[in-house]
């Protein structure tokens, strides 16, 4: 599914992908929040920025994709497919798969989806902030 390894992507290309992911993450979170009475859980943590947070490896794309793929097993909002496709563009071909256990309890499923969706949306905000501040530093 990878046309080019991620290290061939220009910083501007990465920024476009992250901008798109930010927009999609907001859509996902908006829909997930329609399910009233579900609370965020402290049991799940989505990895976000890499230690250096520099392009091309600005975010933990393989781990984030693994979490989104887990959500995809539980939920068929088509925006999730699109998010996964965009994350694919930010992943090295040899990236190892992260294993995530799927919640089995109905309510816990909903909490997992809400928690990860919220963290993913926040993560995309952080990633974009990091990219834009990095781009500003590069031009000064």
């Amino acid at each position: 599914s990878h046309t080019l390894p991620v290290h061939f992507l220009q910083p501007s290309d990465i920024q476009k992908i992250v901008e798109e992911l930010q927009s999609l993450s907001k859509m996902l979170l908006k829909d997930v929040k329609e399910d009233k009475g579900v609370l965020v859980s402290q049991n799940y943590t989505l990895p976000c920025l890499t230690p250096d947070a520099q392009p091309p490896n600005i975010i933990h794309s393989p781990a984030i994709r693994a979490y989104l793929k887990t959500i995809r097993q539980l939920d068929n909002k088509s925006v999730i497919d699109e998010i996964i496709e965009h994350l694919d563009k930010l992943i090295f071909q040899d990236a190892p798969e992260t294993n995530i256990s799927v919640p089995t309890d109905t309510h816990e499923c909903k909490r997992f989806i809400l928690t990860i969706s919220q963290q993913f949306s926040e993560c995309m905000d952080l990633a974009l902030k990091s990219l834009t501040s990095g781009a500003q530093q590069a031009t000064t």
Epitope: M27, K30, Q73, D75, N76, K77, S78, I113
Partner: antibody
Framework: QSQLVESGGGRVQPGGSLRLSCAAS?????????ICWVRQAPGKGLEWIVC?????????YYAPWAKGRFTISKDNSKNTVYLQMNSLRAEDTATYFC???????????????WGQGTQVTVSS | AFQLTQSPSSLSASVGDRVTITCQAS??????LAWYQQKPGKPPKLLIY???KLASGVPSRFSGSGSGTDYTLTISSLQPEDFATYYC??????????WGFGTGTKVTVL
């Protein structure tokens, strides 16, 4: 009591067009489910046509054979989903059902809801 | 293209018999499978969803099992009102699979 009511069926000549409506009552068009059109020709099985997502984006998915001639749309203010059918052929003669399907595997059976169907006959 | 293969297409059985209907998907559908019963002139009635969950009001003689690509509907002891046509359906959604129905299994009196 949640229900779906189809209307707009009838007799139409080959090559003609028809617009079916699926009105939802007892629930609102908020996020997290799909509304689909399914048809059943006389004495035949169920055949999926198209689905539309009720959420922040009106994503649509068509059966490959339905692309081009059939178009799904929705009007949130009227809580209604439509199926526009063009260039109708004799083989489109069927009962057309609209149905609501869950978006989450964790959802309960109440998310599955079918209308009674509307009859479409394509004949000269 | 994605396909759901249901078998058998028809079967004859007697009241009290155990009946098994299978549904095979051409790719994994992660348990996004429902089973319906349909009688002439009526819309389908949900029996099983999420591959194995019994819909409310459905008798416990109906059960569903399976995962990945292979799924089964079992009627443990066929009753007179169970003579009907049964369909499996995936509601996985998304662009890679979409929705779809099995070809149906007509259960008639032996």
């Amino acid at each position: 009591q949640s229900q779906l009511v189809e209307s707009g069926g009838g007799r139409v000549q080959p090559g003609g067009s028809l617009r079916l409506s699926c009105a939802a009552s007892g629930f609102s068009f908020s996020a997290n489910y799909w509304i689909c059109w399914v048809r059943q020709a006389p004495g035949k099985g169920l055949e999926w046509i198209v689905c539309i997502y009720i959420g922040s984006r009106a994503d649509t998915y068509y059966a490959p054979w339905a692309k081009g001639r059939f178009t799904i749309s929705k009007d949130n203010s009227k809580n209604t989903v439509y199926l526009q059918m063009n260039s109708l052929r004799a083989e489109d003669t069927a009962t057309y059902f609209c149905a609501r399907f869950s978006s989450g595997i964790y959802d309960l059976d109440r998310f599955f809801l079918w209308g009674q169907g509307t009859q479409v006959t394509v004949s000269s | 293209a994605f396909q759901l293969t249901q078998s058998p297409s028809s079967l004859s059985a007697s009241v009290g018999d155990r009946v098994t209907i299978t549904c095979q998907a051409s790719q994994s559908i992660d348990s996004w499978l429902a089973w319906y019963q349909q009688k002439p002139g009526k819309p389908p009635k949900l029996l099983i969803y999420q591959a194995s969950k019994l819909a409310s009001g459905v008798p416990s003689r109906f059960s569903g099992s399976g995962s990945g690509t292979d799924y089964t509907l079992t009627i443990s002891s066929l009753q007179p009102e169970d003579f009907a046509t049964y369909y499996c359906q995936t509601y996985y959604g998304g662009g890679h699979i979409g929705w779809g129905f099995g070809t149906g299994t007509k259960v008639t009196v032996l």
